[in-house]
């Protein structure tokens, strides 16, 4: 399935929202931990009849800065947005393509965790990690260190009472030439690749460097889990657990409410706050489901994690284009229509009066009065000479007549307004040009 319509090219981008995982949150609560918008991906145009490709995605890392301590457990929402690049009024149109959400446990400073999330027909593969900015260190970025070269007293900008570590770790030096955008290292001298990149220096894109792939029988997805085959390939962790490789095997970091080697055991209760977006949690009567989320309007899914596609209800009338902006629905109306749902027909002559026997004509996105002979102006209130506008082409002579104007055409012309030359080539008989000969600039006649 292509993300673009056949008519318009589009490009994708991501919005990431992070929230503290343990706090009770109201509906549409802010992204308290942080939020970020990715760069736009390359322009993609659907090729009719071609198999669904992996999609060109925004390049490089998406960093979400967080101000306070890293909470360890966090909720994320990743939205994939489509930007249509047609010549719409008001600039490009945005629409939400896919939305995934989850709750994870992650220590700062740890290795990259990998994840696969599915939303409808889309599968999103991504890696993530939490990293402290110096001088903060530790699994929650709450401890401070001082550089080796700094004196032992507190450096500038550090609170005097903050406990100082002995020394900051020396910054890791990756393998020379390791791509700063697509590679990273956890040991000096190595170069490990992010999703979608391979090669000794992580400069070679895997397939189309895309890790957003349509699922289904028509498309073979190119695996974007890099490096090569490993214990975390295919993500053995169930229920949204994130997989980390260990020297001998793998380790699953389970979201709150799941445990076991592969996060396969569920122990989620309402006390764990599993309902997103202000969903109301009720203890389930069925022993197999420890809770049920009752979702607020606009959300669905077992954890209220999915936004309802309100545009599927086709709220925009008269062929208007529906845009779900998250906080509101917006209708982009076709020419000649207006109103929040494009319900007002601007071309509608109802209630419009044309004076002096004029008739209202609909069309072109505006009302127009077709005035009776001798009247003109927007509402036919002005007296007019019907011949003043020179309505006869090619030198035809205009005569005002009680039933309308009459054009007396010059020789060689015909039509109600003398607009058609009988022999447009003039006197000379030209050899017939074969069809397809490109005409020149338009001829201009008075």
């Amino acid at each position: 399935r292509s993300p673009c319509s056949a008519r318009l090219p589009c490009r994708l981008f991501f919005r990431v929202c992070l929230k503290p995982g343990l706090s009770e949150e109201a509906a549409e609560s802010p992204c308290a931990l942080g939020a970020a918008l990715s760069a736009r991906g390359p322009v993609y145009t659907e090729q009719p009849g071609a198999p669904a490709p992996d999609l060109p995605l925004p390049d490089g890392l998406l960093q979400v800065p967080f101000r306070d301590a890293w909470p360890g457990t966090f909720s994320f929402i990743i939205e994939t947005w489509r930007e249509e690049l047609g010549d719409q009024i008001g600039g490009p149109a945005w629409s939400l393509l896919a939305r995934v959400a989850g709750r994870r446990r992650l220590a700062a400073g740890g290795p990259w965790a990998r994840d696969i999330q599915r939303a409808g027909a889309w599968e999103l593969r991504f890696s993530y990690r939490a990293r402290c900015e110096p001088p903060a260190v530790g699994t929650a970025c709450t401890r401070l260190c001082r550089p080796r070269s700094a004196p032992s007293r507190c450096g500038p900008g550090l609170r005097p009472c903050a406990p100082l570590e002995d020394e900051c770790e020396a910054p890791l030096v990756c393998r020379a030439g390791c791509s700063p955008e697509h590679g990273f290292c956890e040991q000096p001298g190595e170069c490990r690749c992010l999703e979608g990149w391979t090669g000794p220096l992580c400069t070679v894109p895997v397939s189309t460097s895309s890790c957003l792939s349509p699922r289904g029988p028509s498309s073979a997805t190119t695996g974007c889990l890099v490096p090569g085959p490993g214990p975390c390939d295919g993500n053995p962790c169930a229920n949204g657990g994130s997989c980390s490789e260990t020297p001998r095997s793998f380790e699953c970091t389970c979201p709150r409410g799941f445990y076991g080697l592969r996060c396969e055991v569920s122990g989620v209760t309402c006390a764990d706050g599993p309902c997103f977006n202000g969903g109301l949690c009720v203890g389930g009567a069925d022993p197999d489901s420890a809770y049920i989320c009752h979702c607020p309007p606009g959300f669905q899914g077992s954890n209220c994690e999915k936004r309802v596609d309100r545009c599927s209800l086709q709220p925009c009338r008269n062929g208007g284009l529906c845009l779900d902006l998250g906080h509101a629905l917006r209708c982009r109306c076709r020419a000649g229509f207006a109103g929040p749902r494009c319900e007002h027909d601007l071309d509608d002559c109802a209630g419009r009066a044309c004076a002096n026997g004029g008739t209202c004509v609909e069309g072109g996105g505006a009302h127009r009065c077709s005035c009776a002979l001798g009247f003109g102006g927007r509402d036919c209130r002005e007296r007019a000479d019907p011949c003043a506008a020179r309505p006869c082409a090619h030198g035809g002579r205009c005569y005002a007549h009680f039933s309308g104007l009459v054009c007396a055409c010059a020789p060689g012309y015909m039509g109600a307004r003398c607009e058609f030359p009988v022999h447009p080539d003039g006197a000379s008989a030209l050899p017939a040009a074969p069809p397809g000969l490109r005409p020149g600039d338009p001829q201009r006649y008075l």
């Epitope: 039509g415 109600a416 008075l446």
Partner: nanobody
Framework: QVQLQESGGGLVVAGGSLRLSCAAS????????IAWYRQAPGKKRELVAG???????NYVDSVKDRFTISRDNAKNTVYLQMNSLQPEDTAAYYC???????????WGQGTQVTVSS
């Protein structure tokens, strides 16, 4: 700038029918006076039928009662329905537009109609 694109020409046996289409872009056909012309080899280009902005139609005598010109504002296209075609109707058929704003004339690139006996 108005662009005109003709289609629908082809080879037909005498007595048969064809419908030519003239699709306009750059302006609405409701604001244009549009006509069909034809040109046989070695002859002058001649008017066949025309439709004015107010819907008035004109035909040359040789095609009256056989050809019908019409327009579809929604499709921004003008049509020439040609019935009872004769070998003397063989020609390249061209679409012509007269735009009242600026009083410019525009031509399409033509479509070939061949009537065999």
């Amino acid at each position: 700038q108005v662009q005109l694109q003709e289609s629908g020409g082809g080879l037909v046996v005498a007595g048969g029918s064809l419908r030519l289409s003239c699709a306009a872009s750059g302006s609405s056909v409701s604001f244009l006076s549009i006509a069909w012309y034809r040109q046989a080899p070695g002859k002058k280009r001649e008017l066949v039928a025309g439709i004015s902005t107010d819907g008035t139609t004109n035909y040359v005598d040789s095609v009256k009662d056989r050809f019908t010109i019409s327009r579809d504002n929604a499709k921004n296209t003008v049509y020439l329905q040609m019935n009872s075609l004769q070998p003397e109707d063989t020609a390249a058929y061209y679409c012509y537009a007269y735009r009242w704003v600026g009083r410019d004339t525009y031509w399409g690139q033509g479509t070939q109609v061949t009537v065999s006996s």
